[in-house]
């Protein structure tokens, strides 16, 4: 009885566990175990495509880089029709690359939790993590994720990492910038006149505030006198009465701060 | 059908350099690997290096890296084994045999006997 | 690198008896895509090894059916079931799963008792 039927085939991968670290060298052999009739073509394929001027029974991979990991067949061919290989899955594993660091998310709220992740290509996955913030490495800090779950300002700043695996360490990435936005601090209301302050004197008073993030754009006043809103942080009162007793400034950027009230002590003529 | 042959042998002197043959036919020579393997007198197989004559690409032990080159002239079918700076350590009979890939060694030519002597 | 030890060294038999020669291996020698890359040799006296079987269990073209090769993992038989005179001479084992190296058992010679 002969039986026409299209090549059976079977892939062999030196190493065996088609696992090589990159610059080793990968060989694949292509074992027809049966073929009626003979076999007249070979070929082979890596994730579906075929591989130009490949058409022996050995397939040689020197110096292997990391964008030649994939699935690999062979395809052999006779009067009947093509036959497949199963797919061999070749691992080339290297150390890590250049790191990013993804943050989630910047700009933070102070007072809001934040998620720093450290992103390096790698195979097999890296295993350690170190981090470092404004260029300075961050103790006990070894993984992957750095969880900060209440934000401070001082916790703004470059971030950077470096990821390793067992093939080497990676170089640190340009790192990510972390922005803390947080309402004006410190703000006070000033007087600017000198003491005491009698009826009928142009008062002058300023709000001042320590820091803010982002900058401060407006100003607020209270009570609201019959004066004119000013933009900048300086108010000037004409004409002071006495019963124009305490004044309160707030510096505003996306929130605003509000300093204690001040008391003119406004004297009679 | 398939035949590998290799001279019967050669003798050398120390420090100088042999470089073996082993020609091929009844088959197509770019199709399978070429082994070469060496035999002291008495004693076991112990595999030197193979070559694809597709595309010259070698594999060596590494107990022969700098000793032994391997080449092929695929024009002729012939496979070339380089032994450099021989001693006495050297002298054996050296075998090449046709490949399936790195799956099994199927035809195993007659094989060189090396002497290195002075 | 796979160390492969045979046993025994010699092994003397009467034509027409069974002999049967074991070759171990240092790790496994199933390959990644199920297959044992195991084989067997004869070198007969003055002359170049010979393919017996390959892949364990698969006699070469040419060889006769007395020869049979079986085991797995990391023990593995050669038996030849009537010994005949043609078949004396060193049996080496080898293995190509975990290449390079390959690598040759030390082999084992068959003579007449």
């Known amino acids: 009885l002969n039986v026409k039927h299209t090549p059976k085939l079977e892939i062999k991968v030196t190493p065996s566990d088609a696992i090589v670290r990159e610059g080793d060298s990968v060989t694949m052999t292509c074992e027809v175990s049966s073929s009626n009739p003979e076999y007249t073509t070979v070929s082979w394929l890596k994730d579906g495509t075929s591989l130009k001027k490949q058409n022996t029974f050995t397939l040689n991979l020197r110096e292997v880089t990391k964008d030649q990991s994939g699935k690999y067949c062979c395809q052999v061919s006779n009067d009947v029709g093509p036959g497949r290989s199963e797919e061999v899955f070749l691992q080339v594993q290297y150390a890590p690359e250049p790191s990013t660091v993804q943050i989630l998310h910047s700009p933070a709220v102070e007072g809001s939790q934040v998620e720093f992740l450290c992103m390096s290509l790698a195979n097999p996955l890296p295993t350690n993590y170190t981090w470092y913030h404004n260029g300075k490495e961050m103790q006990g800090r070894t993984e992957e994720k750095v969880h900060i779950p209440k934000i401070l300002p001082w916790h703004a700043g470059t971030y950077s990492c470096v990821a390793e695996n067992i093939l080497g360490t990676g170089q640190r990435g340009p790192g990510a910038e972390l922005d803390v936005q947080y309402p004006p601090k410190k703000v006070t209301t000033v007087i600017q006149n000198p003491m005491p302050i009698r009826e009928g004197d142009t008062v002058t008073l300023s709000c001042n505030y320590n820091s803010s993030n982002p900058s401060v754009t407006r100003y607020e006043w209270k009570p609201h006198g019959a004066w004119e809103e000013p933009s900048l942080g300086v108010l000037k009162i004409q004409n002071v009465g006495w019963d124009n007793t305490t004044i309160a400034c707030a510096a505003c950027n996306s929130w605003c701060s509000w300093a204690s009230p001040v008391a003119l002590n406004v004297q009679y003529a | 059908q398939v035949q590998v042959q290799q001279p019967g042998a050669e003798l050398v002197r120390p420090g100088t350099s042999v470089k073996l043959s082993c020609k091929a036919s009844?088959?197509?020579?770019?199709?399978?690997?070429m082994y070469w393997v060496k035999q002291r007198p008495g004693q076991g197989l112990e595999w030197i290096g193979v070559?694809?004559?597709?595309?010259?690409?070698?594999y060596y032990n590494q107990k022969f890296k700098g000793k032994a080159t391997l080449t092929v002239d695929t024009s002729s079918s012939t496979a070339y084994m380089q032994l450099s700076s021989l001693t006495s350590e050297d002298s054996a009979v050296y075998y090449c045999?046709?490949?399936?890939?790195?799956?099994?060694?199927?035809?195993w030519g007659q094989g060189t006997t090396l002497t290195v002597s002075s | 690198d796979v160390v492969m030890t045979q046993t025994p060294l010699s092994l003397p038999v009467s034509l027409g008896d069974q002999a049967s020669i074991s070759c171990r291996s240092s790790?496994?020698?199933?390959?990644?895509?199920?297959?044992?890359?195991l084989h067997w040799y004869l070198q007969k006296p003055g002359q170049s090894p010979k393919l017996l079987i390959y892949?364990?269990?698969n006699r070469f073209s040419g060889v006769p059916d007395r020869f049979s090769g079986s085991g797995s993992g990391t023990d593995f038989t050669l038996k030849i079931s009537r010994v005949e005179a043609e078949d004396l001479g060193v049996y080496f084992c080898?293995?190509?799963?975990?290449?390079?190296?390959?690598?040759f058992g030390g082999g084992t010679k068959l003579e007449i008792k």
């Open positions: 790790q496994s020698l199933v390959h990644s895509n199920g297959n044992t890359y």
């Open positions: 892949k364990v269990s």
């Open positions: 009844g088959y197509t020579f770019t199709r399978y690997w």
């Open positions: 045999a046709r490949g399936y890939g790195s799956s099994y060694v199927g035809y």
């Open positions: 070559i694809d004559p597709s595309d010259n690409f070698t």
């Open positions: 080898s293995q190509s799963t975990h290449v390079p190296p390959w690598t």
